[in-house]
Amino acid sequence: MAVTACQGLGFVVSLIGIAGIIAATCMDQWSTQDLYNNPVTAVFNYQGLWRSCVRESSGFTECRGYFTLLGLPAMLQAVRALMIVGIVLGAIGLLVSIFALKCIRIGSMEDSAKANMTLTSGIMFIVSGLCAIAGVSVFANMLVTNFWMSTANMYTGMGGMVQTVQTRYTFGAALFVGWVAGGLTLIGGVMMCIACRGLAPEETNYKAVSYHASGHSVAYKPGGFKASTGFGSNTKNKKIYDGGARTEDEVQSYPSKHDYV
């Protein structure tokens, strides 16, 4: 029962995690305009992996896709790749884990096969979660680097009265969604791996078989053999990596009640 619960919970957690990874990948708010010095702005910029958007205070929003592949930064391409790999692995993992669920009966599938599939899906979820966390972290690192670079060059063209203020970008909502989703997928994968141990047939102490020899009543206990499942007891030493999830409220770009500017 505990195994079924662990497996089912692992599946649900991974499902939520992968849905979150997909959502994060599609979201436009990977980086948002830094509003620290100007909390009320008439033009608000934000960017995703696939397009950049501008929201005017009039409410008009315009988004432009990145219609080039070669012209994009290598880091952005790497983040895209990591997120897509994470989604693909997660989707395959979900497919495999559906058939591996103990509560679902498919023909005469043995527990050993289900255990194999559970472990496979678990590993896929772990790798998927790690891909998402890595992708989001790479993007976040890129943002931090650019943030401090643009802070150093905050005002360019100061010769005279004219000021050109550079737009600085900070963490968008998608980063937090991605971190949490990656963490959930990772946790779900670990739970699947734990559940797999319960599904794998243990070292069986076979019941004594009574052989009735003529004139004797002697019971023979044949030497037990190990059922080869492919999963030894070494799974007890598995390390669990927990993705640290950060949550922060996103700065609202619209003017809120009674703003003075």
Epitope: V43, E56, S58, S256
Partner: antibody, heavy 118, light 113 residues
Framework: QVQLVQSGAEVKKPGASVKVSCKAS????????MNWVRQAPGQGLEWIGQ????????TYNGKFKGRVTMTADKSTSTVYMELSSLRSEDTAVYFC???????????WGQGTLVTVSS | DIVMTQSPDSLAVSLGERATISCKSS????????????LTWYQQKPGQPPKLLIY???TRESGVPDRFSGSGSGTDFTLTISSLQAEDVAVYYC?????????FGQGTKLEIK
Amino acid sequence: QVQLVQSGAEVKKPGASVKVSCKASGYAFSSYWMNWVRQAPGQGLEWIGQIYPGNGDTTYNGKFKGRVTMTADKSTSTVYMELSSLRSEDTAVYFCARFVKGNAMDYWGQGTLVTVSS
Amino acid sequence: DIVMTQSPDSLAVSLGERATISCKSSQSLLNSGNQKNYLTWYQQKPGQPPKLLIYWASTRESGVPDRFSGSGSGTDFTLTISSLQAEDVAVYYCQNAYSYPFTFGQGTKLEIK
């Protein structure tokens, strides 16, 4: 067609308050910000602030801090701009204007002349 | 606040001739996110409210005659009337639409020579 109709001229004493109304028609009232701009006699334009009738959010020019209040009545598609502690330099024509893409103001009311005189 | 400075304060041009009004801002009005300049031009005739002519520095509002054109980027902008008509006599204002509080130029009075 879009129309913004403002209330009539007002004469106020210094220190008093004035409330100017702007009734909108011909568009989705709650979906557009409404700006208030004033113009002193023979002078240029000065932005006072804006209100979003959909939720009542406002953004004011810091110059008018604490003196201006903008409200909206969705049932009558009317926005109001109240200016308190009036001074003689507040004598101006007050315009309401709809806010659209490009952060531009496309339709304007006919204007309301507010005269502050003792 | 962004300061908008128009020049000249007044301008007299013959009918059918080109009229050019300049507007300078104390800060760049170019938004890096969409490479658009948040500068708006208005026309105000005596006793009337202002009328929107151009937004995003160069996009003509629907219904505005094509003799009106806007150009410029960053801090320097120009409104051009290619062939002045009698009905173009008015005061023209540029406006910062990029940063709160929105600010207007002092206006340029256009007259017929």
